[in-house]
């Protein structure tokens, strides 16, 4: 089963910015541009989906202008010549304010969402598959540009039978307490390729890292516990962390922590003594409010193997256990790249970790 990973995001790129869209645009690709409109200089900024770096061929020019009450221009440029402008005379951006700008490529059009509301659809004037570059210029500061690959793979029954290079997909967020979710989420990002697979040599306590190749699925020697490793580059939208192991027969609790300095950005704490999966954040040694709700019964079982997939998105972490989406945990610590340490401890035996 071939699997195409999502492109790694561009983090805090300087403006003006031009970057390659790996594999070009494809139907279902979602591109998120997250940043802040500068309050001082300039009255315009633009996001361009173009061919090459010259700027002569722009399939989609998205151009907010803080002029004449504010409006947004959409256009296409072919061989250096602009076509007729499409203007939206409403301004969803505010000077000095952050924004969340999301583009969805579809067969007939680009759909653009700004701050959670569909803002405009722009019908293709040129074939979108020609686009291989995104550029941003003007009065804006960027936090990141991320990509969510449209390709998905079927939901697997459990990771334990599947190499991690073929991960499951998150189904849609469960919406009722009774029904199962209706299928595979269509815009699911795949784990990116800059992963590190942590394996263990026969000498206890020694670890080495290998490139992201499909790991052999033979039993590994046990990982040292507690297990601590660095997450290279920290978290960012589309980043995945994969773990598998076995719960000890007499287990009371275990934890998976994603840490930022002295803070625990995400504490995943299955508790067999309470039949609960507790999630929380600890900042300056102070715990926040616990989250415990689950769409189904406790997925971890004493004495049984398990797999956990943690997928980072812009607003939240999505967590799947044994190939089934379990919950979302919305970021309480927002500086994602600083969340760069994984700690696992408690009553389990780890068999595989991929960061």
């Amino acid at each position: 089963m071939a699997f195409s990973g999502s492109q790694a995001p561009y983090l805090s790129p300087a403006v003006p910015f031009s970057g390659t869209i790996q594999g070009g645009l494809q139907d279902g690709l979602q591109i998120t541009v997250n940043g802040t409109v500068l309050s001082s200089s300039g009255t315009r900024f633009a996001v361009n989906f173009q061919t090459g770096f010259s700027g002569n061929d722009i399939a989609f020019h998205f151009n907010p202008r803080f002029e004449d009450g504010g409006y947004v221009v959409c256009n296409t440029r072919q061989n250096g010549s602009w076509g007729p402008e499409e203007r939206k005379t409403h301004m969803p951006f505010q000077k000095g304010m952050p924004f969340d700008l999301c583009f969805l490529v579809q067969s007939s059009d680009f759909k653009v969402m700004v701050n959670g509301i569909l803002f405009v659809q722009y019908f293709h004037r040129v074939p979108f598959h020609r686009v291989d570059t995104i550029s941003v210029n003007g009065s804006v500061q960027l936090s990141y540009i991320s990509f969510q690959n449209p390709r998905t793979v079927p939901v697997q029954p459990a990771f334990s039978t599947v190499p991690f290079s073929q991960p499951v997909c998150f189904p849609p967020r469960p919406r009722g307490r009774r029904q199962k979710p209706p299928g595979v989420w269509p815009a699911n990002p795949a784990p990116i390729t800059q992963t590190v697979i942590h394996t263990v040599q026969s000498a206890p306590g020694q670890m080495f890292s290998t490139p992201a190749i499909p790991p052999m699925m033979y039993p590994h020697p046990a990982y040292p516990m507690p297990f601590i490793t660095t997450i290279l580059g920290g978290l960012y939208p589309s980043k995945s962390i994969l773990l598998s192991g076995t719960v000890l027969p007499s287990a009371q609790r275990f934890h998976i922590n994603l840490c930022s300095g002295n803070h625990i950005a995400f504490h995943l704490n299955p508790r067999f003594d309470e039949n609960a999966v507790v999630r929380n954040t600890q900042i300056d040694n102070s715990w926040g409010s616990e989250e415990r709700s689950l769409p189904r019964k406790m997925p971890f079982v004493r004495g049984q193997s398990f797999s956990v997939w943690i997928l980072c998105e812009a607003h939240c972490l999505k967590v799947a256990v044994d190939g089934q989406h379990l919950f979302e945990y919305y970021h309480r610590l927002r500086n994602l790249p600083t969340i760069n340490r994984l700690e696992v401890g408690g009553d389990i035996q780890l068999t595989h970790v991929q960061t």
Epitope: Q30, H90, Q94, M113, G116, L118, F119, R173, P186, H315
Partner: antibody, heavy 122, light 109 residues
Framework: EVQLVESGGGLVQPGGSLRLSCAAS????????IHWVRQAPGKGLEWVAY????????SYADSVKGRFTISADTSKNTAYLQMNSLRAEDTAVYYC???????????????WGQGTLVTVSS | DIQMTQSPSSLSASVGDRVTITCRAS??????VAWYQQKPGKAPKLLIY???SLYSGVPSRFSGSRSGTDFTLTISSLQPEDFATYYC???????????FGQGTKVEIK
């Protein structure tokens, strides 16, 4: 379990002020847009305002612009609607609702509060 | 503003009937339309999102469709618990990014 609970409604005189609260549990308000929708007695639904706490963006219906202010306190996981210069026509049940967090490309308000009644009368 | 013109404003039907409610948007709103059911004294409940997707837990007799700027909610076989008021809602950014239809009250014949 996701829940939204409104409070702060009551009887107020024309020209007066009220602050409505929408306490969220089961999710964080910073993860989604939060909307206020009202319904006058015997009438239909009217959208009032929304906030996208992740970016701080706010938007208002023309009928309340300049009088109402929507805000969110992410540490308290609560959204607010500050209503000033209230008029008789603002009398309604006010609901807060969450826009779906299922995917950015899903359109619908999936969870609503039970509503709080605001009566503007002398 | 984008107007959502909903029709009919009310209808009488019997259990087992097929019921169709329509909303016409005054301009293109893509598929950014939802349908809600509201019963007296209660908050609205989401039935259909993104024009045609059935919300989890909603019976399959409810369906939504889109044709251009026309949106339709269909109840294939009306049940006693379906007597309520139904609203369409668009969320396509305009001066008011959210607007509701006027509502359709479905009553027992």
């Amino acid at each position: 379990e996701v829940q939204l609970v409104e409070s702060g409604g009551g009887l107020v005189q024309p020209g007066g002020s009220l602050r409505l609260s929408c306490a969220a549990s089961g999710f964080t308000v910073s993860s989604s847009s939060i909307h206020w929708v009202r319904q006058a007695p015997g009438k239909g639904l009217e959208w009032v305002a929304y906030i996208y706490p992740y970016s701080g963006y706010t938007s208002y219906a023309d009928s309340v612009k300049g009088r109402f202010t929507i805000s969110a306190d992410t540490s308290k996981n609560t959204a607010y609607l500050q209503m000033n210069s209230l008029r008789a026509e603002d009398t309604a049940v006010y609901y807060c609702a969450r826009y779906s967090t299922y995917s950015k490309w899903v359109w619908g308000m999936d969870y609503w509060g039970q509503g709080t009644l605001v009566t503007v009368s002398s | 503003d984008i107007q959502m013109t909903q029709s009919p404003s009310s209808l009488s039907a019997s259990v087992g009937d097929r019921v169709t409610i329509t909303c016409r948007a005054s301009q293109s709103v893509s598929s950014a339309v939802a349908w809600y059911q509201q019963k007296p004294g209660k908050a609205p409940k989401l039935l259909i999102y993104s024009a045609s997707s059935l919300y989890s837990g909603v019976p399959s007799r409810f369906s939504g469709s889109r044709s251009g700027t026309d949106f339709t909610l269909t109840i294939s076989s009306l049940q006693p618990e379906d007597f309520a008021t139904y609203y369409c809602q668009q969320s396509y950014y305009d001066s008011n990014p959210i607007t509701f239809g006027q509502g359709t009250k479905v009553e027992i014949k």
